[in-house]
């Protein structure tokens, strides 16, 4: 892939191995775990990143209340099945034949079942709410400066089109970033909001996926923005299907 440099590395994904054996003898970078060639000029899909991770040696300034249908990724890491395009397969199963349905960001959206469980389609996550709490600072950040810096970050670092950053909310010390992207809005070549959110999450945790870049150094007017807690809520185009047992737990 052309973005893989002459020295044959992948700037956008350190969880790859690159060698000069691609078409035309060009550099080709394969994701660890799956072996699929990745496009190093853009973000790698979350599914391939999770698979690589599992294989590695190891407008109103009010806060948004997540919808009753919002999902949080409580299940943690798993080794996912990815489709030929590197997206999550709608049905995921573990080694013991326990299966469940996931959304486009790989978060479980049904109760767990057995191999007979059917997941007819991959349901798109069209709204992501990233809820951050920053460490104490001398004073509150200026909201418009914070808004501009976070929008710049998603545009420049994650290559996410600005139209998909719907809003940035701030009530010290809580920051909320809303990403919205309907199926109809996403054009070929557009970064997926789920992939951008995953890269951001890993950056915030100090586990950058970018090759050779320093970690994320977020500053607002020169003042460091240090995050001490992150919660991410995922809203799907079709509400999830959990039993009442789970909902009342």
């Amino acid at each position: 892939h052309t973005a893989a440099q002459d020295n044959c590395t992948c700037p956008t994904n350190k969880m790859t191995v690159c060698s000069p054996d691609g078409p035309g003898g060009r550099c080709q970078c394969r994701a660890l775990g799956s072996g699929m060639a990745v496009d190093c000029s853009t973000l790698t899909s979350k599914c391939l990143l999770l698979k690589a991770r599992m294989s590695a040696p190891k407008n109103a300034r009010t806060l948004v209340r997540p919808s009753e249908h919002a999902l949080v990724d409580n299940d943690g890491l798993y080794d996912p099945d990815c489709d030929p395009e590197g997206r999550f397969k709608a049905r995921q199963c573990n080694q013991t034949s326990v299966c469940w349905c996931v959304n486009s960001v790989g978060v479980r959206r049904t109760d767990k079942g057995d191999l007979s469980l059917r997941c007819d389609e991959l349901v798109r996550t069209h709204h992501i709410l990233i809820d951050l709490r920053h460490r104490p600072t001398a004073g509150a950040f200026n909201h418009s400066d914070l808004d501009a810096e976070l929008r710049r970050l998603f545009r420049e670092r994650y290559r996410l089109h600005p139209k998909f950053v719907a809003a940035v909310h701030y009530e010290q010390p809580t920051i909320q970033i809303e990403l919205r992207q309907n199926t109809s809005q996403k054009a070929a070549g557009d970064v997926d909001i789920g992939d951008a959110a995953y890269y951001f999450e890993r950056d915030i945790k100090g586990e950058s996926l970018f090759q050779g870049r320093g970690g994320l150094d977020l500053r607002v007017r020169g003042e460091p923005l240090q995050v001490e807690r992150t919660l991410i809520y995922y809203l799907d185009e079709i509400p999830p299907k959990f039993s009442m047992k789970r909902l009342t737990a």
């Epitope: 191995v17 060698s19 054996d21 080709q28 660890l32 072996g35 699929m36 030929p84």
Partner: antibody, heavy 115, light 107 residues
Framework: QVQLQQSGAELVRPGTSVKISCKAS????????LGWVKQRPGHGLEWIGN????????NYNEKFKGKAILTADTSSSTAYMQLSSLTSEDSGVYFC????????WGQGTTLTVSS | DILLTQSPAILSVSPGERVSFSCRAS??????IHWYQQRTNGFPRLLIK???ESISGIPSRFSGSGSGTDFTLSINSVESEDIADYYC?????????FGSGTKLEIK
């Protein structure tokens, strides 16, 4: 020119282990994947797994997990495949090849497992 | 795992004829297919890479085409030295897989 030179034929007893070598020359050993392929008489080609000597990364065909262990010594540009708990089913010819396009192949190592 | 299906199992042709080998993948693999020739008691030799890219030192009578799931290797004028087994292999994702092969015989 690129060459892959494999170790000689092996005749071993069932239940034992064997280690086959593949010495690379003519290219930068640490820059390419090195794969291993099995062929039984009258059968087709079966991919066993591969190793990236530059980082020690390995991948295995599920069928050969627990059977084959791939290693590489970058100082001598040599890849190794150890096969353990050998049975007659493991008899065949084993090839090493530079990947992902298998553009250069070793001459093959014939393994015979017999009591 | 990606399954590669080669057909037919055996091809019998006369010298000078054009011959085509088919390889079908169980999913879309773009152009990540490669073709090999293996003569009796020899090691496989790369003929075509990435579906249609020619290889230095391989006679120009060998060509490849296809993308997605259907691929073809062609020999435009078969010679007696082409008697061999022909295999396709995918490098789209691990585990890499080979087709079951097609044996070329000369009438």
């Amino acid at each position: 020119q690129v060459q892959l030179q494999q170790s000689g034929a092996e005749l071993v007893r069932p239940g034992t282990s064997v280690k086959i070598s593949c010495k690379a020359s003519g290219y930068t050993f640490t820059n390419y994947w090195l794969g291993w392929v099995k062929q039984r008489p009258g059968h087709g080609l079966e991919w066993i797994g591969n190793i990236f000597p530059g980082g020690g990364y390995t991948n295995y065909n599920e069928k050969f997990k627990g059977k084959a262990i791939l290693t590489a010594d970058t100082s001598s540009s040599t890849a190794y495949m150890q096969l353990s708990s050998l049975t007659s089913e493991d008899s065949g010819v084993y090839f090493c090849a530079r990947e992902g396009v298998m553009d250069y192949w070793g001459q093959g190592t014939t393994l015979t497992v017999s009591s | 795992d990606i399954l590669l299906t080669q057909s037919p199992a055996i091809l019998s042709v006369s010298p000078g004829e054009r011959v085509s080998f088919s390889c079908r993948a169980s999913q879309n693999i773009g152009t990540s297919i490669h073709w090999y020739q293996q003569r009796t008691n020899g090691f496989p030799r790369l003929l075509i890479k990435y579906a249609s890219e020619s290889i230095s030192g391989i006679p120009s009578r060998f060509s490849g085409s296809g993308s997605g799931t259907d691929f073809t290797l062609s020999i435009n004028s078969v010679e007696s030295e082409d008697i061999a087994d022909y295999y396709c292999q995918q490098s789209y994702s691990w585990p890499f897989t080979f087709g079951s092969g097609t044996k070329l015989e000369i009438k």
